[in-house]
């Protein structure tokens, strides 16, 4: 059994930031969950990840540099990504797991998401470098 | 032959840190369906889970454990790990590996344990 | 977190008693029809090993003596006919929510 996920095929990103929204044929409500969103074609770079839990506010971080937050719906969950580069063009897949309660669950690879970053062109400092190209 | 052997445990200082291994057999822990779990025993008390790691690599931890703990694994060795740190006397304890399967996670699989005793 | 507490602590009993040992929780740990509470039986010197699962499902190479029932947050494991090698401690397991927790053990004696 997988979870399947919808995702907008194109987003474009005018301003350096934009709002993916994960749709999932499962409903997350007192579910514990691991949402997270993932870069290029081989998801290689996990870009944002929130941790759902019945009895816990909604943790959400990145360890690759990224601004995000998050929000829970029922079955979706909305990925809020900004400052974003324009070499951050990318595909961008929604991936989901479901822990407890068992059995375990996750989705059957999605089609992702294209999000074109238009707009101002954000230089990164010199001190603090954008992630570099892939 | 499903088998899981745990090793790296001995003295260690109060402050310090452990990190022990669990060789696994029998199954590969990036295939879907099963995963691996943590839990240890103080000398004469019950199990305490302090945490698991799935097929994907994501990982769950003990929220009393989780500021200190990691657990990773080397697919390429089919081993997982475990690093506990600023150890503290309250850590001694048995430590086993084991596995559990996605339909109802009961254990079914341990292996024999690691003693790791915390003591200056 | 979930409570799991067993009771009694400990008993003696004798080779070809029956033996029941009891498992609380202090909220249900039944989803969609199924009891995600298990059974290991340790002794000294060993890792715990799998006799129930999912309440009532005997693991694979235990004993039919074994068997558990129960739903929501009461459960017993019965022993039908004790035997000398099952003489040990016998602790439940609930996997219905994180953190996972076992209840503090019953210890069955010899009398």
């Known amino acids: 059994n997988k979870i399947l996920v919808k995702q907008s095929p194109m987003l474009v990103a005018y301003d350096n930031a934009v709002n993916l929204s994960c749709k999932y044929s499962y409903n997350l409500f007192s579910r514990e969950f691991r949402a997270s969103l993932h870069k290029g074609l081989d998801s290689a770079v996990e870009v944002c990840v929130v941790y759902g839990n019945y009895s816990q506010q909604l943790q959400v971080y990145s360890k690759t540099g990224f601004n995000c937050d998050g929000k829970l719906g029922n079955e979706s969950v909305t990925f809020y990504l900004q400052n974003l580069y324009v070499n951050q063009t990318d595909i961008y897949f929604c991936k989901i797991e479901v822990m407890y309660p068992p059995p375990y669950l996750d989705n059957e690879k999605s089609n992702g998401t294209i999000i074109h970053v238009k707009g101002k062109h954000l230089c990164p400092s010199p001190l603090f470098p954008g992630p570099s190209k892939p | 032959e499903v088998q899981l052997v745990e090793s790296g445990g001995g003295l260690v200082q109060p402050g310090g840190s452990l990190r022990l291994s669990c060789a696994a057999s029998?199954?590969?822990?990036?295939?879907?369906?099963?995963?691996v779990g943590w839990i240890r025993q103080a000398p004469g008390k019950g199990l305490e889970w302090i945490g698991e790691i799935y097929h994907s690599g994501s990982t769950y931890y003990n929220p009393s454990l989780k500021s200190r703990v990691t657990i990773s694994r080397d697919n390429s060795k089919n081993t997982l790990y475990l690093q506990l740190n600023s150890l503290r006397a309250e850590d001694t304890a048995v430590y086993y590996c084991a596995r559990y399967k996605y339909d109802y996670y009961d254990f079914d699989y341990w292996g024999q344990g690691t003693l790791v005793t915390v003591s200056s | 977190d979930i409570q799991l507490t067993q009771s009694p602590s400990s008993l003696s009993a004798s080779v070809g008693d029956r033996v029941t040992i009891t498992c609380r929780a202090s909220?249900?740990?039944?989803?969609?029809?199924?009891?995600?509470l298990h059974w290991y039986q340790q002794k000294p010197g060993k890792a715990p090993k799998l006799l129930i699962y999912a309440a009532s499902s005997l693991q694979s190479g235990v004993p039919s003596r074994f068997s558990g029932s129960g739903s929501g947050t009461d459960f017993t494991l019965t022993i039908s006919s004790l035997q000398p090698e099952d003489f040990a401690t016998y602790y439940c397991?609930?996997?219905?929510?994180?953190?996972?927790?076992f209840g503090q053990g019953t210890k069955v004696e010899i009398k």
């Open positions: 397991q609930q996997s219905y929510r994180s953190p996972r927790t």
């Open positions: 029998g199954f590969s822990l990036s295939t879907s369906g099963v995963g």
């Open positions: 909220q249900s740990v039944d989803f969609h029809g199924i009891s995600f």
